[in-house]
């Protein structure tokens, strides 16, 4: 009763919301709510029933599965989604979903901060930029992996000759989508012209 | 907030008839069902009928039939009950009281504070 | 039409005291059936429905148990504010009908 299930998903794609297990058998209604208390649908063993809301017009109720599909969901969509049945025996049953939206993220910039040759090592400081975002950093020299503790949006790391790399590529994601930045210096310790 | 304010205290003729209103607010109206509940004085509840706001589908005591109606007005969220040819034993308190449900599941959530019917020649 | 008996049909009891109200139907209602509370000169109050289950907002000390025919409403440890007439009402068919009531009044 009321376990809750999480579901992330990318912003403007078609969600199915539905419960693992089968419905009880025979139920008498079924109702969907966002935020605890506004309806969405209502199943009443003749017909749904759409009511007023955000939702009118891109959901979709299944009576068979209780699944309720929604179009083209937004981030105003994040909420926590609750299934509710009432059974033949006059008992209700709920489950809950905690849908989140996340818009897919945008393309970073690197900005180079500073750049130095230092007795043969590169002293090198580089930051990586997205309008104000929840993602993570992942940095790669020529496509390898930086180490954990270097992984957040600014990079500052002072390279031996045997460690230089020519390009360097900050990788943000989120839990539904990721994208790339890539900045390449001349050897040893110069940005490449582009 | 969830609120249904029931219109004030009526006095009436035997044989007249009488319309008590509800007006919901704190919620989507068409979303659940109104019953309609009445309390004769020193007496227990009595259950008269159902309407849903969503498509006005109805159902009615049998002591009722014939003498009452059940409408709805979806523009200003408002259940109404009209009774006629009210005797004495019609005087009573009448609830609103909100189903769980659009379609009835007689399980009430919210009850309106009550108008009170007084029959009085 | 379903017919509900309640009993008592009033009860003495004092702050802090376990009190029990049970509730019959003339036929198997399985679990449908909902307790409301009433003060004078007031309105009904949800407090259970589907036998069991408490409608939001009420407190914990209030409960309600059984199935078919035979009902229970349980306060466990009486408040002051807990003094007033207690009804049960069957939900499983038209016509909803109620029992006659319970007070529960300060000894």
């Known amino acids: 009763q009321g376990h809750l299930v999480h579901m992330t998903v990318v912003s403007g794609s078609n969600v199915t919301l539905n419960i693992s297990e089968s419905l009880p058998e025979n139920y008498k209604q079924l109702t969907w709510f966002y935020t605890f208390d506004q309806k969405i649908v209502e199943w009443d063993s003749r017909k749904s029933k759409y009511f007023e809301s955000k939702f009118k017009g891109r959901v979709r109720l299944d009576p068979q599965s209780g699944a309720l599909y929604i179009s083209k969901v937004q981030k105003e969509d994040n909420s926590t989604y609750i299934m509710r049945v009432l059974k033949k025996t006059g008992n209700e049953q709920e489950w809950k979903i905690k849908l989140q939206v996340l818009d897919p993220v945008p393309k970073p910039v690197i900005k180079i901060e500073k750049i130095e040759d230092m007795d043969d090592n590169c002293y090198l400081k580089l930051s990586c930029v997205i309008p104000g975002e929840s993602v993570n950093y992942t940095w790669y020299g020529d496509k390898r992996p930086f180490p954990k503790e270097l992984q957040n949006s600014v990079l500052e790391t002072t390279l031996m000759p045997h460690n230089y790399s020519r390009c360097y590529t900050c990788q943000v994601s989120n839990s539904v989508s990721s994208k790339n930045g890539t900045v390449c210096l001349s050897p040893p310790c110069t940005l490449a012209r582009s | 907030e969830v609120q249904l304010v029931e219109s004030g205290a009526e006095v009436k003729k035997p044989g007249a008839a009488v319309k008590v209103s509800c007006k919901a607010s704190?919620?989507?109206?068409?979303?659940?069902?109104i019953s309609w509940v009445r309390q004769a004085p020193g007496q227990g509840l009595e259950w008269m009928g159902w309407?849903?706001?969503?498509?006005?589908?109805?159902n009615n005591a049998q002591k009722f039939q014939g003498r009452v109606t059940m409408t709805t007005d979806t523009s200003s969220s408002t259940a109404y009950m009209e009774l006629r040819s009210l005797g004495s034993d019609d005087t009573a308190v009448y609830y609103c009281?909100?189903?769980?449900?659009?379609?009835?599941?007689?399980?009430?959530?919210?009850w309106g504070q009550g108008t009170l019917v007084t029959v009085s020649s | 039409d379903i017919v509900m008996t309640q009993s008592p049909s009033s009860v003495s009891a004092s702050v802090g005291d376990r009190v029990t109200i049970t509730c019959r139907a003339s036929?198997?209602?399985?679990?449908?059936l909902a307790w409301s509370q009433q003060k004078p000169g007031k309105a009904p109050k949800a407090l259970i429905y589907?036998?069991?289950s408490l409608q939001s907002g009420v407190p914990s000390r209030f409960s309600g148990s059984g199935s078919g025919t035979d009902f229970t409403l349980t306060i466990s440890s009486l408040q002051p504010e807990d003094f007033a007439t207690y009804y049960c009402?069957?939900?499983?068919?038209?016509?909803?009908?109620f029992g006659q009531g319970t007070k529960v009044e300060i000894k």
């Open positions: 009281a909100r189903d769980r449900y659009s379609s009835s599941s007689g399980y009430f959530d919210y």
């Open positions: 036929q198997d209602i399985s679990s449908w």
């Open positions: 589907a036998a069991s």
């Open positions: 309407i849903s706001a969503y498509d006005g589908d109805t």
């Open positions: 009402q069957q939900a499983n068919s038209f016509p909803y009908t």
């Open positions: 704190g919620y989507t109206f068409t979303a659940y069902g």
